[in-house]
C-alpha cells in the first residue's frame, strides 16, 4: 500500500487526517456539554484510490470490485483507524461531571 | 440511532450488508488462489443518513458537521463493523496450503 503522502491524485487529496473547528452548537452538544466551548475535531477526509492506505484484505477486494462494477460497488472509504480520547465536562441534573470518550477524535486514517 | 431496517431513504437504500458474486479473476487472485473459484463477497453498501447505524460518537459528530459544512466534511460512510473469516486454498511453490483470512468478508455494517 502506498504511504500517506504518496497520493496519486495530488498532494493532500487522498485519505488523511483533517482538523475542523466546531462549537458546541455546531455539534449539537450545547444542552449537555459545558466545556470545551470549541473543539478541534480531527477527522478522516479524502479519496481512497487503488490500494491507498488499504486497511485490510476487504479493502483490497472492494478496490478490485469497484474497478469492475463502479455503479454497484463503491470505492473504499476514508475512516479512522484509531482514536484519541477526549474529556468533556458534562451537565448533569445536579451539576457537572467529567467523562472521557475514547471514540470521538480520529487519530489516524485508513481506507476500507 | 435508527435500527438497520428503518431507512428514511426507502427500503434497502441505507447502509447494509450486500452480497456480490466475484470470480478469482475479478478479484485479481487467479495467480495465487486455487479455491474457491468464485466468492460470495459480503460488503457494506448504502447511504448513511443522519444517525443511521452510527458506529460511535465520531460518526455522530461527522453527521452534524456534514450538515453544516457539506462541501468540507463528508457524510459518514458504510463500512464493516465486523468480519466473517474465510479459508482460501492457496498455491505455493510446492503445492497448496490452507490459509484463513479474518478480514475478508463483512459480517455486519455501520456508519462512520
Amino acid at each position: 500500500a502506498r504511504n500517506g503522502d504518496d497520493c496519486p491524485l495530488g498532494p493532500g487529496r487522498c485519505c488523511r487526517l483533517h482538523t475542523v473547528r466546531a462549537s458546541l452548537e455546531d455539534l449539537g452538544w450545547a444542552d449537555w456539554v459545558l466545556s470545551p466551548r470549541e473543539v478541534q475535531v480531527t477527522m478522516c477526509i479524502g479519496a481512497c484510490p487503488s490500494q491507498f492506505r488499504a486497511a485490510n484484505m476487504h479493502a483490497q477486494i472492494k478496490t478490485s470490485l469497484h474497478r469492475l462494477k463502479p455503479d454497484t460497488v463503491p470505492a473504499p472509504c476514508c475512516v479512522p483507524a484509531s482514536y484519541n480520547p477526549m474529556v468533556l465536562i458534562q451537565k448533569t441534573d445536579t451539576g457537572v461531571s467529567l467523562q472521557t470518550y475514547d471514540d470521538l477524535l480520529a487519530k489516524d486514517c485508513h481506507c476500507i | 440511532a435508527r435500527n438497520g431496517d428503518d431507512c428514511p431513504l426507502g427500503p434497502g437504500r441505507c447502509c447494509r450488508l450486500h452480497t456480490v458474486r466475484a470470480s478469482l479473476e475479478d478479484l485479481g487472485w487467479a495467480d495465487w488462489v486455487l479455491s474457491p473459484r468464485e466468492v460470495q463477497v459480503t460488503m457494506c453498501i448504502g447511504a448513511c443518513p443522519s444517525q443511521f447505524r452510527a458506529a460511535n460518537m465520531h460518526a455522530q459528530i461527522k453527521t452534524s458537521l456534514h450538515r453544516l459544512k457539506p462541501d468540507t466534511v463528508p457524510a459518514p460512510c458504510c463500512v464493516p463493523a465486523s468480519y466473517n473469516p474465510m479459508v482460501l486454498i492457496q498455491k505455493t511453490d510446492t503445492g497448496v496450503s490452507l490459509q484463513t483470512y479474518d478480514d475478508l468478508l463483512a459480517k455486519d455494517c455501520h456508519c462512520i
Epitope: 459545558l34 466545556s35 470545551p36 473543539v39 478541534q40 484519541n84 480520547p85 477526549m86 474529556v87 468533556l88 465536562i89 457537572v96 467529567l98 472521557t100 470521538l104 477524535l105 | -
Partner: antibody, heavy 118, light 107 residues
Framework: QVQLQESGPGLLKPSQTLSLTCTVS??????????VGWIRQPAGKGLEWLAN???????YYNSALKSRLTISKDTSKNQVSLKLSSVTAADTAVYYC??????????WGQGTLVTVSS | DIQMTQSPSTLSASVGDRVTITCKAS??????VAWYQQKPGQPPKALIY???YRYSGVPDRFSGSGSGTDFTLTISSLQAEDVAVYYC?????????FGQGTKLEIK
C-alpha cells in the same frame, strides 16, 4: 479512579534546583482537554498556581516565576515534572499537582512538603 | 494578572446557618470561576465549576452564582464537616489565580 502522586527531595539548600515529579493514574496525559497543573501552598497561607502542561504540550507559567520554572511531561510514563531553579527560603511550601480539565483542578494529589534551608 | 479578592477572610457561623462567601475579580472573567474546599491537612477539593455548576458528589447545600466580576459561594445549611478554607479561582485567562481564601469556623 483518578490519582496523582507528587514526589520530591523534601529538603534543599538555597540556590539549588527543585525537581518534582507527579505520577498520574486513572487518566491519560494525551487525552484532549486534559492537563496537569502545579500549585503550591506555604504553611498557613493560600494557594499559588505555578505552571501547567496540556495534552498537546502547551505550557503556561506563573508570570512572576516564569524565568525559574520548567514543566515537562512523559506521556509513556504518566509523569509530569516541574523544575524550579535558584530556590530560596520563600519557596518552602507544600507542592501539589492536580488534574486540570479546561482550566479547572478536578483532582489533587496529597502534596509534598519542600523545605529550603541552609 | 487578574486578582481575585475574597471576603470575608474569616467567617464564624452556627450549624444550620446560611453562609455566603464572595469573590471579586479585578476584571471580567465571564463565568470562568471555580470554588474549592480545603480541610485541615488535606489537599483542596473541587466544589463548583463555571461559577454555578456543582461537581459530582458535592452535597446540594453548596451552590455558586455570579458572572463578570462578582461571584458567590453559598452553603444553605452549615454542617460541622464544612469547617474548612474556601478558595475561588479564575480560569478565564493565564496566569490562573486564586483568591486568598476564606476560613470558615463553627461558632
Amino acid at each position: 479512579q483518578v490519582q496523582l502522586q507528587e514526589s520530591g527531595p523534601g529538603l534543599l539548600k538555597p540556590s539549588q534546583t527543585l525537581s518534582l515529579t507527579c505520577t498520574v493514574s486513572g487518566f491519560s496525559l494525551s487525552t484532549y482537554g486534559m492537563g496537569v497543573g502545579w500549585i503550591r501552598q506555604p504553611a498557613g497561607k493560600g494557594l499559588e498556581w505555578l505552571a501547567n502542561i496540556w495534552w498537546n504540550d502547551d505550557k503556561y507559567y506563573n508570570s512572576a516565576l516564569k524565568s525559574r520554572l520548567t514543566i515537562s511531561k512523559d506521556t509513556s510514563k504518566n509523569q509530569v515534572s516541574l523544575k524550579l531553579s535558584s530556590v530560596t527560603a520563600a519557596d518552602t511550601a507544600v507542592y501539589y499537582c492536580a488534574q486540570e480539565v479546561y482550566g479547572w483542578f478536578a483532582y489533587w494529589g496529597q502534596g509534598t512538603l519542600v523545605t529550603v534551608s541552609s | 494578572d487578574i486578582q481575585m479578592t475574597q471576603s470575608p477572610s474569616t467567617l464564624s457561623a452556627s450549624v444550620g446557618d446560611r453562609v455566603t462567601i464572595t469573590c471579586k475579580a479585578s476584571q471580567n472573567v465571564g463565568t470562568n470561576v471555580a470554588w474549592y474546599q480545603q480541610k485541615p491537612g488535606q489537599p483542596p477539593k473541587a466544589l463548583i465549576y463555571s461559577a454555578s455548576y456543582r461537581y459530582s458528589g458535592v452535597p446540594d447545600r453548596f451552590s455558586g452564582s455570579g458572572s463578570g466580576t462578582d461571584f458567590t459561594l453559598t452553603i444553605s445549611s452549615l454542617q460541622a464537616e464544612d469547617v474548612a478554607v474556601y478558595y475561588c479561582q479564575q480560569y478565564n485567562s493565564y496566569p490562573l489565580t486564586f483568591g486568598q481564601g476564606t476560613k470558615l469556623e463553627i461558632k
